[in-house]
């Protein structure tokens, strides 16, 4: 089937353009091209005849083409109107026609874009400002920048008008950006010289600087003022109402206390036609006044919170000096200094920071102290402690229980007996105890700022015959020669008597053993294998007596020396070598040999069968005791004779 | 202004790849429309590609059409012309060119210019 090709199919204005013939029959008499989807005398660009090879222009003729033999048609120097259809008309040589039509389309080099605004110098949030991309071009697509980059999602952006318009709703300061204009058809791309938005804004709220409000007499009073505004604010300044003058500084040298007043600068943007105003407080001292502590938590809360406390008042070039319980600042990473020295910050504060703290303010003459200020931490309550410590009464006697929890504000205290309420007191008062009377017994303390509770419970038995005694120690595998050991027999009970026995024997004077806490309790320093024995405690009282069962002590020793038996050094070539190896331990030890340096096995006893003259050398055990940390290692020569060398050699085993 | 470098060039056979490079420096890479031109022995300069300055749209002249791709790496400064089945045709001194507010087929569009790279296609 005949068609053509347009190559390319989109043609830059200038350009050239070929109109390419695909499947031309065979047996031609001639073919015509005319401009447009149809033949059409009037239309006609060219005719040729094959047979007398000649090309006549036809009324659609321009002079830009040209038409090769196989059909094609090249147009050169295309312009805008050459764009659309083109129909091939073939005569063949039976004088049947055929037709086939191509097209395609020309875009104009595009010309550089400008961007028009409808707003110069939009007011934030109250002006929109529309940019239009110029100059509208047919088939270009239109796009836009800012600062370079593709445009933001927001719904304060807005495109129409097929992208040429850019809209921004309500400008804002941050849409203070550089924007351009891009616009494309199918041969060209054009990008606009950036368009600067000039928002125009404020006064912001001004800051006046420096903070500080308090100054002495003589000194100099320099105040700068600032808001953000644009185009920049102009600046005035009153004094207690009375215009002074329109800068943005004020200076005042040698002040004195007549100048102490109200401050007020007035920043005004007049092409916004805003006024923002902010007054400062300004208060002149005759001499440094007397400072005090201000503090951002009046009530903190143990290991919670961090306290801020503040020199007042702030004086401009003045160094500020603190103390803590009458002495200088002690180094600690929970103390932080600002960089003026007039705040004092605890981070983190404890129960032991409450103070007295001071402040002073250092003059030429002399430093003027604050009035201490004690901190109220809020802590605890801290574990209960009930005492008596007895947990044993006889019947008959006055059951009288206190109960004591550090905590600020002071603890609430409550008492359960066996999880049932009593009452709400520090002290629990039962006269005339009976067995009853055994059982739970639990004191809650409650801090009622923090709103922390704790409670302690103590197990009372109350009998007429005293309890089997238990010994408890604070270590059961105490090592030799390293740790102590305490033994302490249980329980604790009122007007009785504690005894201690070892080995069924009453204890060896030593100073290697102590008793302490009324007896109750039995300390072994320095601890060694032989006292490895069985201990048992005590306890009488006028009416009963009892002893606990033994408790033997294991203590941790060793590996000592170890010893390599038989002790033979000499054995002749082809007997057994038998080696054995012990050491004093406790617990058992682990054995292993090397032979000339070269581990061996990790057994206790080293058999080589038939030794020979190459078994000679160092037979090293090494003993190790996992328990203690502890190691230690003998080294024994073996010589091996070839048989019948020398008399008087062992046989081995 | 921007400073063009060219690299990749090289001899290759016909039906061969090559991926020619140009690094820029001196200005903000991104601010560019890039062109790739080239011009072999005795011809006048010819249109390649061209891509514009966020690298959504590219032209390419018809003779290398569906045959070399443009592209850009803007976070590298670098403009890149991949170019596959390879013609003896397309032996010349590759340019790669710059300009901040035109991107087409036109040479004069471009005031910025590097010093070239040579592709020679041959078996």
């Known amino acids: 089937k005949l068609t053509i090709e347009s190559t390319p199919f989109n043609v830059a204005e200038g350009k050239e353009v070929l109109l390419l013939v695909h499947n031309l029959p065979q047996h031609l008499f001639g073919y015509s091209w005319y401009k447009g989807e149809r033949v059409d005398g009037n239309r006609q660009i060219i005719g040729y005849v094959i047979g007398t090879q000649q090309a006549t222009p036809g009324p659609a003729y321009s002079g830009r083409e040209i038409i090769y033999p196989n059909a094609s048609l090249l147009i050169q120097n295309i312009i805008q109107n050459d764009t659309g259809f083109y129909t091939l008309h073939v005569i063949k040589s039976d004088l049947v026609n055929e037709e086939a039509t191509g097209q395609f389309r020309v875009y104009p080099e595009l010309p550089k874009p400008s961007i028009s605004s409808n707003n110069s110098k939009p007011v934030e949030d109250k002006d929109a400002v529309a940019f239009t991309c110029e100059p509208e071009t047919q088939d270009a697509t239109y796009l836009w920048w800012v600062n370079n980059q593709s445009l933001p999602v927001s719904p304060r952006l807005q495109l129409s008008n097929g992208n040429r318009t850019l809209t921004l709703f309500n400008v804002t300061r941050n849409d203070t950006a550089s924007y351009k204009c891009e616009t494309q058809n199918p041969v060209s791309a054009r990008r606009s010289d950036s368009v600067i938005l000039n928002v125009l804004y404020g006064p912001d709220a001004p800051t006046i600087s420096p903070l500080n409000t308090s100054y002495r007499s003589g000194e100099n009073l320099n105040l700068s003022c600032h808001a953000a505004s644009n185009p920049p604010a102009q600046y005035s300044w009153f004094v207690n109402g009375t215009f002074q003058q329109s800068t943005q500084e004020l200076f005042i040298p040698n002040i004195t206390v007549n100048n102490s007043g109200s401050y007020t600068c007035q920043a005004h943007n007049s092409d916004t036609g805003l006024n923002r105003t902010t007054v400062t407080t300004i208060t002149v001292y005759a001499e440094p006044p007397k400072p005090f502590i201000t503090s951002n938590n009046s009530n903190p809360v143990e290991d919670e919170d961090a306290v801020a406390l503040t020199c007042e008042p702030e004086i401009q070039n003045t160094t500020y000096l603190w103390w803590v319980n009458n002495q200088s600042l002690p180094v600690s990473p929970r103390l932080q200094l600002s960089n003026d020295n007039r705040t004092l910050t605890l981070l983190s504060v404890t129960r032991n920071d409450v103070g007295p703290y001071e402040c002073g303010i250092q003059n030429e003459l002399s430093v003027d102290h604050s009035d201490p200020v004690i901190l109220n931490v809020l802590y605890g309550p801290d574990d209960p402690t009930i005492s008596p410590s007895y947990t044993y009464y006889r019947p008959g006697v006055n059951l009288s229980l206190s109960c004591h929890a550090a905590s600020n504000p002071p603890a609430q205290y409550s008492w359960l007996i066996d999880g049932n309420i009593q009452q709400h007191t520090q002290e629990l008062f039962i006269s005339n105890i009976t067995e009853k009377n055994s059982g739970l017994y639990t004191c809650q303390a409650n801090n009622s700022a923090s709103g922390h509770s704790r409670t302690t419970v103590k197990t009372i038995t109350v009998s007429a015959e005293l309890p089997k005694p238990s010994i408890s120690s604070n270590n059961s595998k105490p090592v030799e020669d390293k740790d102590a050991v305490a033994f302490t027999c249980e329980p604790e009970a009122q007007n009785t008597t504690y005894l201690w026995w070892v080995n069924g024997q009453s204890l060896p004077v030593s100073p290697r053993l102590q008793l302490s806490n009324g007896n109750r309790t039995l300390t072994l320093f320095n601890v060694t294998r032989n006292d490895a024995r069985a201990y048992v405690c005590g306890i009488q009282n006028s009416v009963s007596a009892n002893r606990s069962d033994p408790v033997t002590l294991d203590v941790l020793y060793g590996p000592d020396t170890p010893i390599i038996s038989p002790p033979d050094s000499s054995y002749l070539s082809g007997a057994n070598l038998n080696l054995s190896c012990h050491s004093a331990s406790n617990p058992s030890p682990q054995y292993s040999w090397r032979i000339n340096g070269i581990p061996q096995q990790h057994t206790q006893v080293l058999f080589i069968a038939k030794i020979t003259p190459n078994n000679n050398g160092t037979y090293a055990c090494f003993v190790s005791n996992l328990a203690t940390g502890r190691n230690n290692s003998i080294v024994k020569s073996i010589t091996v004779s070839a048989s019948g060398t020398s008399p008087g050699l062992s046989a081995g085993a | 202004e921007v400073q063009l470098v060219e690299s990749g060039g090289g001899v290759v056979q016909p039906g061969g790849s090559l991926r020619l490079s140009c690094a820029a420096s001196?200005?903000?890479?991104?601010?560019?429309?890039l062109g790739w031109f080239r011009q072999a022995p005795g011809k006048e300069r010819e249109f390649v590609a061209a891509?514009?300055?966020?690298?959504?749209?590219?032209y390419y002249a018809d003779s290398v059409e569906g045959r070399f791709t443009i592209s850009r790496d803007n976070a590298k400064n670098t403009l890149y012309l991949q170019m596959n089945s390879l013609r003896p045709e397309d032996t010349a001194l590759y340019y790669c060119?710059?300009?901040?507010?035109?991107?087409?087929?036109?040479?004069?569009?471009?005031?910025?210019w590097g010093q070239g790279t040579l592709v020679t296609v041959s078996s």
């Open positions: 060119a710059a300009s901040s507010d035109y991107a087409g087929g036109n040479p004069t569009g471009y005031p910025y």
């Open positions: 001196g200005h903000t890479f991104s601010e560019y429309a």
């Open positions: 891509i514009n300055w966020g690298g959504g749209w590219t």
